[in-house]
């Protein structure tokens, strides 16, 4: 197993609709054809998997149907979108990239993107 550099933004603020997007960029040392991208969340001294997708270079990223993540790939960049976020989901979201094929296997882990989620205030009652 070999190490690989992964870059991602330090901070992202989710939209009022609970959607956060960020770019995960990896420095591919070779010509990988199969790449696995995993989003991890670190909070309260625990790391949990948020979503994961394996894709062939040049093809679209495909997450499971019930995943809260969507994404697109372009070269060595993956554009990730996480939806359905609430204030309690605030945390450090880490991009993990694995070059699965061909060998050798490479593993890269980003420094994490701190995603802040603020629940919208309920609209006050209106006479109109």
């Amino acid at each position: 197993c070999k190490a690989m550099h992964v870059a991602q933004p330090a901070v992202v603020l989710a939209s009022s609709r609970g959607i956060a997007s960020f770019v995960c960029e990896y420095a591919s040392p070779g010509k990988a054809t199969e790449v696995r991208v995993t989003v991890l969340r670190q909070a309260d001294s625990q790391v949990t998997e948020v979503c994961a997708a394996t894709y062939m270079m040049g093809n679209e990223l495909t997450f499971l149907d019930d995943s809260i993540c969507t994404g697109t790939s372009s070269g060595n960049q993956v554009n990730l979108t996480i939806q359905g976020l609430r204030a309690m989901d605030t945390g450090l979201y880490i991009c993990k990239v694995e070059l699965m094929y061909p060998p050798p296997y490479y593993l890269g882990i980003g420094n994490g993107t701190q995603i802040y989620v603020i629940d919208p205030e309920p609209c006050p009652d209106s006479d109109f």
Epitope: S45, Q46, L92, L107, I109, N111, G112
Partner: nanobody, 126 residues
Framework: QVQLVESGGGLVQPGGSLRLSCEAS????????IGWFRQAPGKEREEVSC????????NYADSVKGRFTVSRDNSRNSVILQMNSLKPEDTGVYYC???????????????????WGQGTQVTVSS
């Protein structure tokens, strides 16, 4: 709240083997840096081994190199210390320690640890 629990200690003859396990209750050890320490009677506590959060890096004290092997068993949410060719001087209480570092340090062992288990006794004697 995560707690660390060691198991696998016991009495073994010189040259024998033991397999210590460090498991987490109340959480997981995924991406945690895990260290193994030991304390022999009347001696200072010493670190014998550690494994990084990714599992790609392992370190060993000179006194156990080539005899001890640390590994992660993610399917069982545990870290294993395989001890072979045991010597009487390996006798002591073995402690599992852990710390979840920032992701930028997941490929490294921790310099200090937040959590300590209760320890498991290892006695090497004929």
């Amino acid at each position: 709240q995560v707690q660390l629990v060691e198991s696998g200690g016991g009495l073994v003859q010189p040259g024998g083997s033991l397999r210590l396990s460090c498991e987490a209750s109340g959480g997981t050890l995924d991406y945690w840096s895990i260290g193994w320490f030991r304390q022999a009677p009347g001696k200072e506590r010493e670190e014998v081994s550690c494994i990084s959060g990714t599992g790609l890096r392992t370190n060993y004290a000179d006194s156990v190199k080539g005899r001890f092997t640390v590994s992660r068993d993610n399917s069982r949410n545990s870290v294993i210390l395989q001890m072979n060719s045991l010597k009487p001087e390996d006798t002591g209480v073995y402690y599992c320690t852990g710390k979840l570092l920032h992701p930028s340090l997941w490929s490294a062992c921790a310099n200090e640890y937040d959590l300590w288990g209760q320890g498991t006794q290892v006695t090497v004697s004929s």
